[in-house]
């Protein structure tokens, strides 16, 4: 089996189920999908008026 547990069909889905490590649960499609890793927010430079935008690592294809 390549994938982790699945959710049920239908729009009234149960809570997210565990996925295999390279995946995460997409609430929109109620399914485990390939996921990249979020980077931690970059530290705000001293005196900056707004925080630097957050970014992410691309999913491995």
């Amino acid at each position: 089996m390549r994938r982790g547990p699945r959710s049920l069909r239908g729009r009234d889905a149960p809570a997210p189920t565990p996925c295999v490590p390279a995946e995460c649960f997409d609430l929109l499609v109620r399914h485990c999908v390939a996921c990249g890793l979020l980077r931690a927010p970059r530290p705000k430079p001293a005196g900056a008026s707004s925080p630097a935008p957050r970014t992410a690592l691309q999913p491995q294809e």
């Epitope: 995460c24 997409d26 609430l27 929109l28 499609v29 996921c35 990249g36 999913p59």
Partner: antibody, heavy 125, light 107 residues
């Protein structure tokens, strides 16, 4: 390079059918969800349908339910939108898009990151 | 279905201006909001996902904030290439729904 290429649009009479294709390259569609989004001339974006190609789960906008069918062939890395009983209000540019996900505490944080160039569907007599 | 209401529907601004576009969801969508930029005749481009995360390759003058029902896209210093239409989209619950769009025009 990730790419999505739509084809199959054209002019069709009301009540007719069309099949749109979305050929993916640079990634495997079974790893993501694939969505169709349309845009009527001069209007905003409207989501149409999604599929998770790894298991064939689908969902549809109420406006197309029962008339449109989304499918995917993972061996061809291609998604499809079969459009039946077409109406004038279905006239739009149809885009396919990949939904990308990033892991936020086990849950997807994401959006539609790659889109095709769009294919125009015109329903008119 | 969740309605996404954008404001304003259009705005005129000059290069260098700070521009703010807001989006209100009809119910709580947590942080499951993305923002897209679209130019005439082109496909939309992802700018921001999960309300505040900048998508890869997007200039840092774009930023997003908000959670629950109220969300904001800010362009800190408008550039000539930023004149376009911007859409918010919620992806918390199917069907994913878009705002009606905000057209940013040259003053």
């Amino acid at each position: 390079e990730v790419q999505l290429v739509e084809s199959g649009g054209g002019l069709v009479q009301p009540g007719g059918s069309l099949r749109l294709s979305c050929a993916a390259s640079g990634f495997t569609i079974s790893s993501n969800s694939i969505h169709w989004v349309r845009q009527a001339p001069g209007k905003g974006l409207e989501w149409v349908a999604w599929i998770t190609p790894s298991d064939g789960n689908t969902d549809y906008a109420d406006s197309v339910k029962g008339r449109f069918t989304i499918s995917a062939d993972t061996s061809k890395n291609t998604a499809y939108l079969q459009m039946n009983s077409l109406r004038a209000e279905d006239t739009a540019v149809y885009y396919c898009a990949r939904r990308v996900c990033y892991n936020r505490l086990g849950v997807c944080a994401g959006g539609m990151d790659y889109w095709g160039q769009g294919t125009l569907v015109t329903v008119s007599s | 279905d969740i309605q996404m209401t954008q404001s304003p529907s259009s705005l005129s601004a000059s290069v260098g201006d700070r521009v703010t576009i807001t989006c209100r969801a009809s119910q709580d969508v947590s942080t499951a909001v993305a923002w897209y930029q679209q130019k005439p005749g082109k496909a939309p481009k992802l700018l921001i996902y999960s309300a505040s995360f900048l998508y890869s390759g997007v200039p840092s003058r774009f930023s997003g904030s908000g959670s629950g029902t109220d969300f904001t896209l800010t362009i800190s210093s408008l550039q000539p290439e930023d004149f376009a239409t911007y859409y918010c989209q919620q992806s918390r619950i199917t069907p994913p729904t878009f705002g009606q769009g905000t057209k940013v025009e040259i003053k």
